[in-house]
């Protein structure tokens, strides 16, 4: 697999600043993406009243957004580094179709949406370099993703606003869980 940017053994830094370790760089990348999500959520909340909707009301959706569970080995109880890393990478790969959906959902933050999407791709590269068991990582089927995207884009305005809000909220929660887990590795 290609080596992620910043992970080449021949990489060097200018004398005044040591290169970050792989873990530090991953940590920084996730924090950057989380900042971007906050900015996107701000625009979404200003535009619609989705942010005031109760969690219960929003829970009744048919989106199959990645979520951390006990069996994934990412929580403190039952922590398993390799299982968890596979879950984080698989989850991020599954989120990619939803990040693609977000690309045309923002007006003033179009560039921010793009930065979140592309910086997530680089994060996946970083994590794939870290993972030993790449065979355990399942890549989503492109045809399934394409039809999901079409279906999401065909929803009415209210559902599209709700979908946008849910994607951002779920992605934020997933990244926060990933960040906590990666700090234990």
């Amino acid at each position: 697999a290609p080596v992620p940017p910043g992970e080449d053994s021949k990489d060097v830094a200018a004398p005044h600043r040591q290169p970050l370790t792989s873990s530090e760089r991953i940590d920084k990348q996730i924090r950057y993406i989380l900042d971007g999500i906050s900015a996107l959520r701000k625009e979404t909340c200003n535009k619609s009243n989705m942010c005031e909707s109760s969690k219960e009301a929003l829970a009744e959706n048919n989106l199959n957004l990645p979520k951390m569970a006990e069996k994934d080995g990412c929580f403190q109880s039952g922590f398993n580094e390799e299982t968890c890393l596979v879950k984080i990478i698989t989850g991020l790969l599954e989120f990619e179709v939803y990040l693609e959906y977000l690309q045309n959902r923002f007006e003033s933050s179009e560039e921010q949406a793009r930065a979140v999407q592309m910086s997530t791709k680089v994060l996946i590269q970083f994590l794939q370099k870290k993972a030993k068991n790449l065979d355990a990582i399942t890549t989503p089927d492109p045809t399934t993703n394409a039809s999901l995207l079409t279906k999401l884009q065909a929803q009415n305005q209210w559902l599209q606003d709700m979908t946008t809000h849910l994607i951002l909220r779920s992605f934020k929660e997933f990244l926060q869980s990933s960040l906590r887990a990666l700090r234990q590795m």
């Epitope: 992620p4 910043g6 005044h16 600043r17 920084k28 900042d35 930065a115 910086s119 791709k121 590269q125």
Partner: antibody, heavy 119, light 107 residues
Framework: QVQLQQSGPQLVRPGASVKISCKAS????????MHWVKQRPGQGLEWIGM????????RLNQKFKDKATLTVDESSSTAHMQFKRPTSEDSAVYYC????????????WGQGTLVTVSA | DIQMSQTSSSLPASLGDRVTISCKAS??????LNWYQQKPDGTVKLLIY???RLHSGVPSRFSGSGSGTDFSLTISNLEQEDIATYFC?????????FGAGTKLELK
Amino acid sequence: QVQLQQSGPQLVRPGASVKISCKASGYSFNRSWMHWVKQRPGQGLEWIGMIDPSDTETRLNQKFKDKATLTVDESSSTAHMQFKRPTSEDSAVYYCARAYGFSIEFAYWGQGTLVTVSA
Amino acid sequence: DIQMSQTSSSLPASLGDRVTISCKASQDIRSYLNWYQQKPDGTVKLLIYYTSRLHSGVPSRFSGSGSGTDFSLTISNLEQEDIATYFCQQGATLPLTFGAGTKLELK
């Protein structure tokens, strides 16, 4: 809109130090990598390295590790590239370019700075 | 380092033509491939990122495709303003590397 304004052309003597700058506007300067690219006359593009303005973490192409130093001045949203002991091989146009956040494409480019090394 | 090859250094074409420029990577770079346009005055612009995504403001006559090691940029209906040099660039690993460029020239 996003703008990267580079410093003007420079004629330098071999061995003297060269510093070129790239002033950013229209976006949050410390929220994306700034890259530097070299183009010799009539040649292709060559990646020199990149810097994260938020903490000055720098990644350099091995080929330029003894040649280029990348720095930033966050207060003026300006990136700098300094190179040591210039020779005729360093005569080129140098571009700064920023990514979409912390990513690996050059989304916006400066207009380029021509550096000519000549005795 | 990953080598990027653009087999045609120059490509003669006529206005209105459908033009395809190819780029080959020395190893698998998945979809981490970007395309740039450099005008004769030296101005450089991103056209396509991540193989097929159109950068904002880029006309829809530009499109990109490929994956792994073989990629292409297509201009569906060549216009005068498209006469320029086109570079591909891989983003799979550092150092980031470019192809040597393909110069579009009018027949």
